[in-house]
């Protein structure tokens, strides 16, 4: 449906409030270093222009594409060259190359100061003084730090953020009310950002077919009663939504997501029995709720897949006629029967099936060739099952912090060239799989664990892509999206690595460690652990444990001392010497 003015169309569909919020998110995700005030000014100018187009769609420039309008606006920023360097060259290009250029310069790890949470009273005063600016600042700060954050979902987070301040700033104990809510929003926000980053990586690095395969598997697990045609329609629409958001087309994305939620709710009888509550909610909550909805019950009677996909004499004929449709049906039928499998496992099985048909349908006796295809699935199924069992046992034995440390050592030995902050961040997140998934019954463990690990390993991949240092990481990240986790699991100690030279400065600590939160103190200790492994990759578990125990005792002792700084200086020297001796450095 062609509109004379795209900007007017989106303004009318979304309403002024959402329009302004989404433009702000879009601009902050592109120009991540620009000051808040500059972005607000740009957004206001775009909004005023949009209003003129709503009043008269034939007005000057109203027929221009959103990319042209937004790109032109971004290119008016005076400090573009000095702030962003070569990104300024994007402005010399024409659309659509200019937008592609901006997308390529999105930075997953921008050099921005850590967000420090002010005192509760300070935040509440700011909220009451100017609620609109306060909420815009939230959108801006999150968007610039997470340039692929799912924009319509960020509107939902902002709504919850506002609700938290509205409720808690008038509570008797503001801090007790507000801080847990902000912690929850922060943790959920990080998880949401990482999940969306994987979707965008899937689309951008592996293409639409890869994303669609993922969506078929996930939606078939979630909506096992829906027919294949219905799932296919949802997959097509969902792919469009995520392609738009990942491509910076946030207005179209939010609009199409709302349409998809509307369609799902209007057709819930043929999709899922679990949607009723979601569909009674307002738009932002509704879309979020649908995205998180639990799997529907499986239909009462599903036959064995063997009849259609192995025994039928038409397997090769059906495959040849429409390969992707036939494979899509295979994936749909398999996934709806297996909510206990991870999506990536289902995709591995489908890939194995595809490879087998490619080979066998060209053979003299195709049926004889592919008759035992499901035997090939067994090792693929058992590998993640065994891995999860072993790691959950280790997690239950060690607890989260020590389990993270075990992973830190494991991954530092696999890929010691990766920067220490990245290894710490990724290993800490990998370690969270324990508390997140091991509590589940076996039927829910694999989808929880392996699909979560895919999200975390994608963080490693996007951070590594910015400054590649390890061929092994590049290989695991680029060869196959669904085999990333098995690829990393299979890596052994990197025997080619030349140990880092010992630097006492790395292991010099000061009294400021005593005022850190427990989490920040853990990160300091884990940073030291990674550095130890980089110095001594062949160190045994026992050696590392001894050094880490000494380190913990040293921190505890000096934090209790009267003269903390002197203690850290003197005892620190002793600790370094003892550690060197223990590790044979």
């Amino acid at each position: 449906d062609a509109h004379k003015s795209e900007v007017a169309h989106r303004f009318k569909d979304l309403g002024e409030e959402n329009f302004k919020a989404l433009v702000l998110i879009a601009f902050a995700q592109y120009l991540q270093q620009c000051p808040f005030e500059d972005h607000v000014k740009l957004v206001n100018e775009v909004t005023e222009f949009a209003k003129t187009c709503v009043a008269d769609e034939s007005a000057e420039n109203c027929d221009k594409s959103l990319h042209t309008l937004f790109g032109d606006k971004l290119c008016t920023v005076a400090t573009l060259r000095e702030t962003y360097g070569e990104m300024a060259d994007c402005c010399a290009k024409q659309e659509p190359e200019r937008n592609e250029c901006f997308l390529q310069h999105k930075d997953d790890n921008p050099n921005l100061p850590r967000l420090v949470r002010p005192e509760v009273d300070v935040m509440c005063t700011a909220f009451h003084d100017n609620e609109e600016t306060f909420l815009k600042k939230y959108l801006y700060e999150i968007a610039r730090r997470h340039p692929y954050f799912y924009a319509p979902e960020l509107l939902f987070f902002a709504k919850r953020y506002k609700a938290a301040f509205t409720e808690c700033c008038q509570a008797a104990d503001k801090a007790a009310c507000l801080l847990p809510k902000l912690d929850e929003l922060r943790d959920e926000g990080k998880a949401s950002s990482a999940k969306q980053r994987l979707k965008c990586a899937s689309l951008q690095k592996f293409g639409e077919r890869a994303f669609k395969a993922w969506a078929v598997a996930r939606l078939s697990q979630r909506f096992p009663k829906a027919e294949f045609a219905e799932v296919s329609k949802l997959v097509t629409d969902l792919t469009k939504v995520h392609t738009e958001c990942c491509h910076g087309d946030l207005l179209e994305c939010a609009d199409d997501r709302a349409d998809l939620a509307k369609y799902i709710c209007e057709n819930q009888d043929s999709i899922s029995s679990k949607l009723k509550e979601c569909c009674e909610k307002p738009l932002l909550e509704k879309s979020h709720c649908i995205a998180e909805v639990e799997n529907d019950e499986m239909p009462a009677d599903l036959p064995s897949l063997a009849a259609d996909f192995v025994e039928s004499k038409d397997v090769c004929k059906n495959y040849a006629e429409a390969k992707d449709v036939f494979l899509g049906m295979f994936l749909y039928e398999y996934a709806r029967r297996h909510p206990d499998y991870s999506v990536v496992l289902l995709l591995r099985l489908a890939k194995t099936y595809e490879t087998t048909l490619e080979k066998c349908c060209a053979a003299a006796d195709p049926h004889e060739c592919y008759a035992k295809v499901f035997d090939e699935f067994k090792p693929l199924v058992e590998e993640p099952q065994n891995l999860i069992k072993q790691n959950c046992e280790l997690f239950e034995q060690l607890g989260e912090y020590k389990f993270q440390n075990a992973l830190l050592v494991r991954y530092t030995k696999k890929v010691p060239q990766v920067s220490t902050p990245t290894l710490v961040e990724v290993s800490r997140n990998l370690g969270k799989v324990g508390s997140k998934c091991c509590k589940h019954p076996e039927a829910k463990r694999m989808p929880c664990a392996e699909d979560y690990l895919s999200v975390v390993l994608n963080q490693l991949c996007v951070l590594h892509e910015k400054t590649p240092v390890s061929d092994r990481v590049t290989k695991c990240c680029t060869e196959s999206l669904v085999n990333r986790r098995p690829c990393f699991s299979a890596l052994e100690v990197d025997e080619t690595y030349v140990p880092k030279e010992f630097n006492a400065e790395t292991f010099t600590f000061h009294a400021d460690i005593c005022t850190l939160s427990e989490k920040e103190r853990q990160i300091k200790k884990q940073t030291a652990l990674v550095e130890l492994v980089k110095h001594k990759p062949k160190a045994t578990k026992e050696q590392l444990k001894a050094v880490m125990d000494d380190f913990a005792a040293f921190v505890e002792k000096c934090c209790k001392a009267d003269d903390k700084e002197t203690c850290f200086a003197e005892e620190g020297k002793k600790l370094v010497a003892a550690s060197q001796a223990a590790l044979g450095l």
Partner: nanobody, 124 residues
Amino acid sequence: DVQLVESGGGVVQPGGSLRLSCAASGSTISSYVMGWFRRAPGKEREFVAAISRSGGYTYYADSVKGRFTISRDNSKKTVYLQMNSLRPEDTALYYCAAGRYSAWYSQSYEYDYWGQGTLVTVSS
């Protein structure tokens, strides 16, 4: 969890019949695909027959098609294997299995719970 106990095995002459039963305790079986597998002396465990959750679909190994019939009574939490025209090569330990999620009924790795087995000997 489901506990499975097989019964009905025994010694029978070639051409004879036996009816095996598999009684479940613990959870209801209506949400499980139920299957029978067997292991002959010195051989690998092999699939025999399986039945879908409500009993609408059955699936058999080629070697038993037309001779064996699998059925279930969800209200009694029991699965049956009627074995006719028995042959010496049917001699094996017969196991009952339950799979919460099963796409390929013939694959042992898709079954979560297993009985201890009942012995069937076909001999003249």
